[in-house]
Interface confidence: low
């Protein structure tokens, strides 16, 4: 396996001001070893592992305001440890493809 | 960046448990790419239950296979082609 912490840029949206701020943070990316069982035993469902967080913390950033909107605080998750493990569907949207970490609904991006 | 060389590609390999001399059972195994990151606001808005993290993943699965019966009467899949595609058993 080569699932590891990677530097990424995430976009944090300030909806009412129609802009995003970009933040450098760490998240998980890489390759995980999986296999498709030849004998499908319903009593023992197989587990497919995905590169996901083992430990995470939350960080808070001040998002600047605009015109009639004050600054606000935005809290986002940061991975501190990664592994090839099960996707925790309670906290995670387990999908094939999402919008990507730096998706911004608006044209304007602030550093 | 994560290095693909560190992990063997998703390919057919012999399954030692079900294979017999002259009658190999092949199985898809190997590595596929996945990543996780904070869920963008636009995605959160479409969720009934909001999830803070998005995990994008594919798993090494059989693209095609033949069903065969092996010793002991077990019905198994003899995989004939593999690919990195939808994970079905990766959620907890």
């Amino acid at each position: 396996n080569s699932c590891e912490l990677t530097n990424i840029t995430i976009a944090i949206e300030k909806e009412e001001c129609r802009f995003c701020i970009s933040i450098n943070t760490t998240w998980c990316a890489g390759y995980c070893y999986t296999r498709d069982l030849v004998y499908k035993d319903p009593a023992r469902p197989k587990i497919q592992k995905t590169c996901t967080f083992k430990e995470l913390v939350y960080e808070t950033v001040r998002v600047p305001g605009c015109a009639h909107h004050a600054d606000s605080l935005y809290t986002y998750p940061v991975a501190t440890q990664c592994h090839c493990g099960k996707c925790d569907s309670d906290s995670t949207d387990c999908t094939v493809r999402g919008l990507g970490p730096s998706y911004c609904s608006f044209g304007e991006m602030k550093e | 960046a994560p290095d693909v060389q560190d992990c063997p590609e998703c390919t057919l390999q012999e399954n030692p448990f079900f294979s017999q001399p002259g009658a190999p059972i092949l199985q898809c195994m190997g590595c596929c790419f996945s990543r996780a990151y904070p869920t963008p606001l636009r995605s959160k808005k479409t969720m009934l239950v909001q999830k803070n993290v998005t995990s994008e993943s594919t798993c090494c699965v059989a693209k095609s296979y033949n069903r065969v019966t092996v010793m002991g009467g077990f019905k198994v899949e003899n995989h004939t082609a593999c690919h990195c595609s939808t994970c079905y058993y990766h959620k907890s």
């Epitope: 970009s22 450098n24 550093e111 | 960046a1 590609e9 596929c32 790419f33 693209k63 593999c82």
Partner: antibody, heavy 122, light 104 residues
């Protein structure tokens, strides 16, 4: 050796549609995302979208939604792009290109087809 | 993505640097491509500085944050081409406008 062989040049009328193809060889077609890129003189390169033949998943640049439709035939290892309601703005060279990482749509494009010239003219 | 120089003239044997600037940080998710006059496109550098297989070692890439560059250390006749940068940090993937390299 990875090869992407695109179909030949097309001369088409405005308002009609065209479907161009990209035949892949030298690798497992279903394991890699295949992207499409548009090149117009003076406009550089533009990413249209991509498809993962392993599951039929597609992703489009908002700009090309409704204009391009991406499909793939796994039995012949061929990807297709259909362009509809053609105008002179669609006159361009269209490239298919494969991602470098198996199972992943990230990483840009490691291998490119030779390009298909589409000319829209009355 | 911006490639400020649209064309560049250099002599054989020269060290040539082509730059590319992003409007926001792209975490090194940047590739460089070469398009020959016949239209053929090849990947040269991926993830800012990794050399794609089969690419001569005279090509190198560097950069971080928003500013990136491609360097050809010893210009050869076959390097005459247009060079494009591309980011894959944020959808949609975007390319620079290209820098056409010519021989003096």
């Amino acid at each position: 050796e990875v090869q992407l062989q695109e179909s030949g040049a097309e001369l088409v009328r405005p308002g009609t549609s065209v479907k161009i193809s990209c035949k892949a060889s030298g690798y497992t077609f279903t394991n890699y995302w295949l992207g499409w890129v548009k090149q117009r003189p003076g406009h550089g390169l533009e990413w249209i979208g991509d498809i993962y033949p392993g599951g039929g998943y597609t992703n489009y640049n908002e700009k090309f939604k409704g204009k391009a439709t991406l499909t793939a035939d796994t039995s012949s290892s061929t990807a297709y792009m259909q362009l509809s309601s053609l105008t002179s703005e669609d006159s361009a060279v269209y490239f298919c290109a494969r991602t470098p990482l198996y199972g992943s749509s990230y990483g840009g494009f490691a291998y490119w087809g030779q390009g298909t010239l589409v000319t829209v003219s009355a | 993505k911006t490639q400020t120089t649209s064309s560049l003239s250099a002599s054989l044997g020269d060290r040539v640097t082509i730059s590319c600037s992003a409007s926001q940080g792209i975490s090194n998710y940047l590739n460089w491509y070469q398009q020959k006059p016949d239209g053929t496109v090849k990947l040269l550098i991926y993830y800012t500085s990794s050399l794609h297989s089969g690419v001569p070692s005279r090509f190198s890439g560097s950069g971080s944050g928003t500013d990136y560059s491609l360097t050809i250390s010893n210009l050869e006749p076959e390097d005459i081409a247009t060079y494009y940068c591309q980011q894959y940090s944020k959808l949609p993937w975007t390319f620079g406008g290209g820098t056409k390299l010519e021989i003096k």
